[in-house]
């Protein structure tokens, strides 16, 4: 999906008001310095692409985050504020959600969510130069 036409300010507002808090809750008990940020993004559409991928695509060691509250809220925000956010995209993540049997917070998942926090922070500061 091409995130170019999303209403970025509305997505930012949704992140600041609710998604960020859920990410913090998920990471509670973890030191902010515990993980290095290895995933980056260069502009807002790119950030949303990376956020979408890390949130909904299963990775080795972290089967799925799709049932977490921050993921459901992310999907809702994209469904509302990205025109034509593809039905296949949403259907794919729903299929993943159904396959998931139980919530297990692994260290790999914590690392992945830490990366997500970094991507969201970057999304919120689009005018900053890449480090």
């Amino acid at each position: 999906y091409d995130f170019t036409n999303c209403d970025f300010e509305k997505i930012k507002a949704a992140y600041l008001s609710t998604i960020s808090k859920d990410l913090i809750t998920y990471m509670s008990g973890t030191k902010s310095t515990e993980f290095n940020n290895t995933v980056s993004c260069s502009n807002r559409p790119h950030c949303l692409t990376e956020i979408q991928s890390l949130t909904f695509n299963p990775t080795a060691g972290c089967a799925s985050l799709a049932k977490e509250m921050f993921a459901m809220k992310t999907k809702a925000a994209l469904a509302i504020w990205c025109p034509g956010y593809s039905e296949t995209q949403i259907n794919a993540t729903q299929a993943m959600k159904k396959r998931r049997k139980r919530k297990v917070t692994t260290n790999k998942c914590l690392e992945q969510v830490s990366q997500l926090q970094g991507l969201w922070r970057r999304f919120n500061r689009p005018l900053l130069k890449q480090q």
């Epitope: 998604i19 459901m72 999907k75 509302i80 504020w81 990205c82 025109p83």
Partner: antibody, heavy 120, light 111 residues
């Protein structure tokens, strides 16, 4: 039973406000969108706005911006629609409708409707 | 923010097929696959018949089908039955400024 139950008919004076409630049961209220749609006598359907409690997002149709307020109480699974500065043209049946989860623009469940009559 | 355009009326005999059109623009029907159709009997709430322009919710007879070409969506009712007599409304997602548009409605009469 999956349903939306709305409050009863209202008769209002021009210039006043009306608040209609819509109680959901049988589904997880927060993750769906609850839209409000009205239908004037003998006329078509008109969308007023939507609330998605999961992300605390409320969106209003441009025509009603500033005059309509949609709220939700997740503890009671109830949505509310308040319309202010009423005029005779606001006489209509007001429906709440559930937008499918993440497909907020398809209304797969409707309330029974609430008739609001604006008359002096 | 004008409504989608539907013919005010349509009719057919029992057993026949009838097609109702719904014309929009590239900013709504033409731009997305998010077209839905609702059936409304007098004094009742609308009922979702078609969504995502050609999908049927469970419980809707397969006599109802939807299609889309360019800026126009269509609802076809085949094998007309007396209970199909109702008003039919199309609706489309219209982007993040307008969000939802409805058609003016079509009264379907079964002769």
């Amino acid at each position: 039973q999956v349903q939306l139950v709305q409050s009863g008919a209202e008769v209002k004076k021009p210039g006043s406000s009306v608040k209609v409630s819509c109680k959901a049961s049988g589904f997880t209220f927060g993750s769906y969108g609850i839209s409000w749609v009205r239908q004037a006598p003998g006329q078509g359907l008109e969308w007023l706005g939507v609330i998605v409690p999961l992300v605390g997002v409320t969106i209003y149709a441009e025509k009603f911006q500033g005059r309509v307020t949609i709220t939700a109480d997740t503890s009671t699974s109830t949505a509310y629609m308040e319309l202010s500065s009423l005029r005779s043209e606001d006489t209509a049946v007001y429906y709440c409708a559930r937008g499918q989860e993440y497909f907020y623009w398809y209304f797969d469940l409707w309330g029974q409707g609430t008739l609001v009559t604006v008359s002096s | 923010q004008s409504a989608l355009t539907q013919p005010p009326s349509a009719s057919g005999s029992p057993g026949q097929s009838v097609t109702i059109s719904c014309t929009g623009t590239s900013s709504d029907i033409g731009g997305y696959n998010r077209v839905s159709w609702y059936q409304q009997h007098p004094g009742k709430a609308p009922k979702l018949m078609i969504y995502e322009f050609n999908k049927r919710p469970s419980g809707v007879p397969d006599r109802f089908s939807g299609s889309k070409s360019g800026n126009t969506a269509s609802l076809t009712v085949s094998g007309l039955q007396a209970e199909d007599e109702a008003d039919y409304y199309c609706s489309s997602y219209a982007g993040t400024d307008i969000f939802v548009l409805f058609g003016g409605g079509t009264k379907l009469t079964v002769l």
